[in-house]
Interface confidence: medium
């Protein structure tokens, strides 16, 4: 099916940019794996590399305003020709569930004292309002809370006394249109206009005073322009070439308004002076090598010694990576391949351990299934043997780190009924459902 | 372990109606989103419509988009397929499948038939003046 290819994927946002154009197949689309596609317009955005994991979306505001409740984040698993790590194809999104409390407490009304006594009237002539008040406490509100209705109220007073009215111009009135639209007649064009003093008009008893300055005001006509040209365009000009040497590119054709061109601001030519086709190299852009993650550490040894486990000898491990997905000669990966450190074996050896602290309350799981929980741990944590942290191995070569490697076997005094591992779980409260931002409303 | 059962498949007129069920026995039935697929005679078998655990999200593929209608009752351990204005080309043997809720959501993953970890016999409907 045809999908709209566009030049630019815009990793913060997941937004497509630089339209190139529809019509166009995605494989001719991904011949370039810097371009992007949409299946339609306003859909979700495909970039054309190999896919991987969006970055994880903000969290989604907490689902109760106040006490405990639950909220949602998402990630998309984005890109063409391939899968995203878990075997997940592209599009599908993954969920991620925690407990939140914007607000320990939830709000409580409060309740009004009496009225207090009326405040003086607001005008000393004519008529006016007063006001009083009255406070909210009680009892006072608690968490945030208020009080229903309202802290204040007014009502009309009079204080039987006339107020004097003066003057006030109404707004002028429209200038009467000049005699001509372009310059050059024999008359040189004037306009006018007038205002009234009837906004309003003085009072005579008590006397109000009467509108200051002139009732009316003219002026010439300046800067009419002379009559206007409208502009023309001319032909189009020769098609610009292909921009690019692999994949899709976009030609333009140009033209010029002036046949003839506007003058004394007669309208420009309507439409564009620009037109684009899309252009089809038919080859594939060059595709640069990308290191996947560092592969395990081997195990820690010292050659010609058949173990080094529980002792305090030093051995050395290394650990790989590979540059995957370089095509139509693209850059190699940059940096090693290879990754070299010095090492003390731990692997199995029994070591005296403690509990840890409670861990922090982990996610809920499952975050889009039913009745999820979150738990925390305590865990029996090996005291790791005091040898040196860094040897010298060979004379002039400075001190290198020594890390310690493998699984060893704490042992901790029993914790509940435990020796490595105690947990503790709580269902999560007030659970959105997991709704998919880009599907549209069925 | 899920076992799912349809049932609703038959000869219809084109312009016609018809309403597929799919039972399922097993007390976790709620905690798995449900998906219908159709397969016709020397074709690939084909996403039809799917809809998650708490029926919070239901999907369709484009064909039958404003057509067919899924719906669930978890109490009644079924899920619905409505099939309306059917065309000759919706021939095919319909089969109701179930995946395991969790992490995962979005068309494209419940479109993936590899997902689903239990399938039924699949119920024949045929399209025909």
């Known amino acids: 099916d045809p999908v709209l290819c566009f030049t630019q994927y815009e990793e913060s946002s997941g937004k497509c940019k630089g339209l190139l154009g529809g019509g166009v197949s995605v494989e001719d689309c991904c011949l370039n794996t810097a371009f992007a596609y949409q299946k339609r317009s306003g859909g979700l955005c495909q970039p054309c590399r190999s896919p991987r994991w969006s970055l994880w979306s903000t969290w989604a505001p907490c689902s109760v305003t106040c006490s405990e409740g639950s909220q949602l984040r998402y990630r998309r698993c984005v890109g063409w020709n391939g899968q995203c790590s878990g075997k997940v194809a592209p599009g599908t999104l993954e969920w991620q569930l925690q407990a939140c409390e914007d607000q320990q407490c939830c709000p409580e009304m409060g309740g009004w004292s009496g009225w207090g006594p009326w405040e003086p009237c607001s005008v000393t002539c004519s008529k006016g309002t007063r006001t009083r008040r009255r406070a909210c406490n009680h009892p006072a509100p608690k968490c945030g809370g208020h009080c229903p209705g309202q802290a204040q109220e007014s009502e009309a007073c009079d204080t039987q006394q006339v107020c004097p009215t003066h003057g006030a111009w109404a707004t002028w009135g429209p200038w009467t249109p000049c005699s001509a639209s372009c310059h050059g007649g024999p008359h040189e064009p004037k306009e006018t206009r007038s205002r009234k003093c009837s906004a309003p008009e003085p009072s005579q008893k008590p006397p109000g005073k009467p509108c200051p300055g002139l009732a009316y005001e003219q002026r010439r006509c300046t800067g009419l322009p002379p009559c206007p040209v409208a502009g023309g365009w001319g032909p189009w000009g020769p098609v610009s070439p292909c921009p690019v040497t692999c994949g899709l590119g976009q030609t333009m054709e140009q033209r010029t308004c002036n046949h003839p061109v506007p003058q004394h601001g007669g309208p420009f030519c309507a439409g564009d002076a620009t037109r684009t086709h899309i252009c089809n190299t038919a080859v594939p852009c060059p595709v640069d090598g990308e290191w996947d993650s560092w592969g395990e550490w081997s195990p820690c040894i010292r050659r010609n010694m058949k173990s080094i486990s529980c002792q305090e000898i030093p051995g050395q491990q290394s650990r790989g990576r590979t540059c995957r997905g370089r095509k139509f000669d693209g850059h190699r990966c940059a940096g090693q391949q290879q990754d070299i450190r010095h090492c003390y074996s731990i692997q199995h050896c029994p070591l005296k351990g403690s509990w840890s602290e409670w861990s922090t309350w982990g996610l809920c799981m499952p975050p889009c299934g039913p009745n999820p929980t979150r738990a925390r741990q305590r865990l029996c944590t090996p005291l790791l043997p005091k040898y040196p942290p860094t040897v010298s191995m060979v004379e002039g070569q400075g001190e290198k780190n020594v890390t310690f490697w493998g699984r060893p076997l704490p042992r901790c005094e029993e914790l509940q009924g435990q020796k490595l591992v105690v947990e503790e779980k709580r269902p999560c409260l007030h659970v959105p459902a997991c709704k998919d931002p880009e599907e549209e409303e069925l | 372990q899920v076992q799912v059962v349809e049932s609703g498949g038959g000869l219809v007129q084109p312009g016609g109606s018809l309403s597929l069920s799919c039972a399922a026995s097993g007390r976790t039935f709620s905690s798995y989103a449900m998906g219908w697929f159709r397969q016709a005679p020397g074709k690939e078998r084909e996403f039809v419509a799917a809809i998650t655990w708490d029926g919070a999200n239901i999907y369709y593929a484009d064909s039958v988009k404003g057509r067919f209608t899924l719906s669930r009752d978890n109490a009644e351990n079924t899920v619905w397929l409505q099939l309306n204005s059917l065309k000759p080309e919706d021939t095919a043997v319909y089969y109701c499948?179930?995946?395991?809720?969790?992490?995962?959501?979005?068309?494209?993953?419940?479109?993936?038939?590899?997902?689903?970890?239990?399938w039924g016999q699949g119920t024949l409907v045929t399209v025909s003046g």
């Open positions: 499948a179930a995946a395991e809720s969790g992490r995962y959501s979005g068309r494209d993953y419940y479109s993936a038939p590899g997902v689903y970890l239990y």
